[in-house]
């Protein structure tokens, strides 16, 4: 999916009202310095495909954040404001439901999603010169 | 304007089946989660799940041990809960609420279903 | 499963008095995940205020709402007689969601 065509400034909106306070949920406990930000982004597209990949494809480890609450804010802030995004998500989504663990937060996940928070402050902050 | 119409009034034998339909319009069907709520007579509210259209993701709520399907076809923009095995505690208004991000961006059941009363009777 | 616990049951007011409703949560939530919901006799429930304290579209300014971590409260500074209803707090911080068991705001 091309997230060119996004209202990012919405998206941005409901990530700072309430999806970032699930990803803090989520994380509570862990120090912010536990781990280091691999993954980074250019542009808010370019940032939005990153997050969409982390939050919803199951990766060696962590099969299992597409069922958190800040995946169900997320999905819906990018099908209401990115348009065509929900039609192209039918068979990513099947084929995960296929393959879908029981719901365990491991130490990859909370790696994952600490990734997820960087790529989120990443896309908050489009004018700043990549590191 | 969204709204949610809500199929009538059912009676049922228990043991048997259920199934509501939550018609919508006025909205992008596909784009927003479609929960389903209950409510026994003089009792509060309780979530049962909810479904996202766009690829028919769910998310169920465990009380009701598998006995809750929802479904949706995007064909009519209409979400479906099915209730299985039912028992006279489940006589209840049923309830479908689209689920959004209001004008503050709080994600919240900002439209409501207008109710389905199911009652449970030998 | 966050437990919401709605005090009082029953909250008997007369028209123009202060009426203070409480939500308490079993876990700490963020408070942009607390909504308050209105319902009348024989309706559906209705959005009344956003994240603790944002009001719905159309919602008198003598609602209030604030709180935080496990500690809410809706208030209605001045008690009209269309705000004679039963009102529910609901969570959005985590599966399964969850509602108080509803505060009736009744005639005095």
């Known amino acids: 999916y091309d997230f060119t065509n996004c209202d990012f400034e919405k998206i941005k909106a409901a990530y700072l009202s309430t999806i970032s306070k699930d990803l803090i949920t989520y994380m509570s406990g862990t120090k912010s310095t536990e781990f280091n930000n691999t993954v980074s982004c250019s542009n808010r597209p370019h940032c939005l495909t990153e997050i969409q990949s982390l939050t919803f494809n199951p990766t060696a480890g962590c099969a299992s954040l597409a069922k958190e609450m800040f995946a169900m804010k997320t999905k819906a802030a990018l099908a209401i404001w990115c348009p065509g995004y929900s039609e192209t998500q039918i068979n990513a989504t099947q084929a995960m439901k296929k393959r879908r663990k029981r719901k365990v937060t491991t130490n990859k996940c909370l790696e994952q999603v600490s990734q997820l928070q960087g790529l989120w402050r990443r896309f908050n902050r489009p004018l700043l010169k990549q590191q | 304007q969204v709204q949610l119409v809500q199929s009538g009034a059912e009676v049922k034998k228990p043991g048997s089946s259920v199934k509501v339909s939550c018609k919508s319009s006025g909205y992008a069907f596909s784009s927003y989660w479609i929960n389903w709520v209950r409510q026994a007579p003089g009792q509060g509210l309780e979530w049962m799940g909810q479904i996202f259209p766009g690829d028919g993701d769910t998310t169920y709520n465990g009380n009701f041990k598998g006995r809750v399907t929802i479904t949706a076809d995007k064909s009519t923009s209409t979400a479906y809960m099915e209730l299985s095995s039912l028992r006279s505690e489940d006589t209840a208004v049923y309830y479908c609420a689209r689920s959004g991000f209001d004008y503050g961006y709080f994600y919240a059941m900002d439209y409501w279903g207008q109710g389905t009363t199911v009652t449970v009777s030998s | 499963e966050i437990v919401m616990t709605q005090s009082p049951a029953t909250l008997s007011v007369s028209p123009g008095e202060r009426a203070t409703l409480s939500c308490s949560v079993s876990s700490s939530i963020s408070s942009s995940n607390l909504h308050w919901y209105q319902q009348k006799p024989g309706q559906s429930p209705r959005p009344w205020i956003f994240g603790t304290s944002n009001l719905a579209s159309g919602i008198p300014a003598r609602f209030s709402g604030s709180g935080s971590g496990t500690e809410f409260t809706l208030t209605i500074s001045s008690l009209q007689s269309e705000d004679f209803a039963v009102y529910y707090c609901?969570?959005?911080?985590?599966?399964?969601?969850?509602f108080g068991g509803g505060t009736k705001v009744e005639i005095k």
């Open positions: 609901q969570q959005w911080s985590s599966y399964p969601l969850t």
